[in-house]
C-alpha cells in the first residue's frame, strides 16, 4: 500500500499558485506524484509522475473554485488521492507592493508599485484584479516604537513637515477594503531629512 | 450564448497593416475584460492584448508593444485590434474574447467567450 502524499497545502502569493506536498516515509523506494485540477467536471494532470513535492497551478482561473487532487505513486501502485478546493481570488496572498521613496528638505516623497501577477501583462497588477485596491502606510521615527498609519487615495503621497535631519523609516501594503484583507508589507525603507525649508525672517 | 465573431484579416506583407474587428452578435460587448489571442501554426495559444472597462487600460505582450492597439467602439458594439509594422512571426490566428469576471487579462483560462477566429498572414 503506497502511502498519501502529507501536508498538502496551497501556497499561492499574488496567483503565483504552488500546490505542495510532503513525500511520505515509505521503505520500498523513492515516491512519484501526480497532480491533477478538474475542469468541465474531468480531471486533467498538471504534473505527471513528478519526483517534485510542488506543482506549479498559476495558469488556473483567477476566479471559482478550483478542486487539485495528488497522489503518490510507485511502479504500478498508488495512493489514494488527497483533494483540497482553492479560490485563487479569495485565498492568493497580497504580496508586498514595491515603493519609492525621495527626500526633500523636511517631507518624503512616496510612490507605490503594485504588486506584479504570475502570468499576466506587466501593466495588469493585483491594483487590476481588485476594485477596492488601495495602500495602508506606516511610517515612525527610527529608533521609537510609536507608528502612524494613513490610507492615501492615490499611488503616491507626501509626508510634510517632518523633523529635519531626522530618519524616518516607511513600509506599505496591499488592502481591500471591501473585503477587509490586507497583505503583506515591504520591508521598511528609512531616509534621513534634511534641513527645514521655512526661511528665516 | 454569446457569439463573438471576428473580421479583418487577411494576407499582407511584412511592414503592412491591418485592422481586425470583433463583434458580438445580438449582444452588446459591455464585459470587463475583452481581449485578443492568437495562435500560430503549431504552437499554443498566446495573449496579445486586452482592454479594461472599469478603466479604459489597456495591456500588451512584450512581442507586440509599439505595433498594436487596441480599442472598442462602444457605440458600435466593436473590439479593434490595428496591427501596425507586421513581420512573419505575427502570422497566426487571431481570437477575440471576453471575460465575465474581469479579473485576467493574459490568460485564457479568465476568459468566457470566444470567437471562432480570423486568419493573419504576413508574408512576402
Known amino acids: 500500500m503506497v502511502p498519501p502524499p502529507e501536508n498538502v497545502r496551497m501556497n499561492s502569493v499574488n496567483f503565483k499558485n504552488i500546490l505542495q506536498w510532503e513525500s511520505p516515509a515509505f521503505a520500498k523506494g523513492n515516491l512519484t506524484f501526480t497532480a491533477q485540477y478538474l475542469s468541465y467536471r474531468i480531471f486533467q494532470d498538471k504534473c505527471m509522475n513528478t519526483t517534485l513535492t510542488e506543482c506549479d497551478f498559476s495558469s488556473l482561473s483567477k476566479y471559482g473554485d478550483h478542486t487539485l487532487r495528488v497522489r503518490a505513486e510507485f511502479a504500478d501502485e498508488h495512493s489514494d488521492w488527497v483533494n483540497i478546493t482553492f479560490c485563487p481570488v479569495d485565498d492568493t496572498i497580497i504580496g508586498p507592493p514595491g515603493m519609492q521613496v525621495e527626500v526633500l528638505a523636511d517631507s518624503l516623497h512616496m510612490r507605490f508599485l503594485a504588486p506584479k501577477i504570475e502570468n499576466e501583462y506587466e501593466t495588469w497588477t493585483m491594483k487590476n484584479v481588485y476594485n477596492s485596491w488601495t495602500y495602508n502606510v506606516q511610517y515612525w521615527k527610527n529608533g521609537t516604537d510609536e507608528k502612524f498609519q494613513i490610507t492615501p487615495q492615490y499611488d503616491f503621497e507626501v509626508l510634510r513637515n517632518l523633523e529635519p535631519w531626522t530618519t524616518y523609516c516607511v513600509q506599505v501594503r496591499g488592502f481591500l477594503p471591501d473585503r477587509n484583507k490586507a497583505g503583506e508589507w515591504s520591508e521598511p525603507v528609512c531616509e534621513q531629512t534634511t534641513h527645514d525649508e521655512t526661511v528665516p525672517s | 450564448e454569446v457569439q463573438l465573431v471576428e473580421s479583418g484579416g487577411g494576407l499582407v506583407q511584412p511592414g503592412g497593416s491591418l485592422r481586425l474587428s470583433c463583434a458580438a452578435s445580438?449582444?452588446?460587448?459591455?464585459?470587463?475584460?475583452i481581449g485578443w489571442f492568437r495562435q500560430a501554426p503549431g504552437k499554443g495559444l498566446e495573449g496579445v492584448s486586452c482592454?479594461?472597462?472599469?478603466?479604459?487600460?489597456?495591456h500588451y505582450a512584450d512581442s507586440v508593444k509599439g505595433r498594436f492597439t487596441i480599442s472598442r467602439d462602444n457605440s458600435k458594439n466593436t473590439l479593434y485590434l490595428q496591427m501596425n509594422s507586421l513581420r512573419a512571426e505575427d502570422t497566426a490566428v487571431y481570437y477575440c474574447?471576453?471575460?465575465?469576471?474581469?479579473?485576467?487579462?493574459?490568460?485564457?483560462?479568465?476568459?468566457?467567450?470566444w470567437g471562432q477566429g480570423t486568419q493573419v498572414t504576413v508574408s512576402s
Open positions: 474574447a471576453a471575460s465575465l469576471h474581469g479579473l485576467g487579462c493574459k490568460s485564457e483560462a479568465d476568459y468566457d467567450y
Open positions: 445580438g449582444n452588446s460587448l459591455d464585459y470587463p475584460t
Open positions: 482592454i479594461s472597462a472599469s478603466d479604459g487600460s489597456t
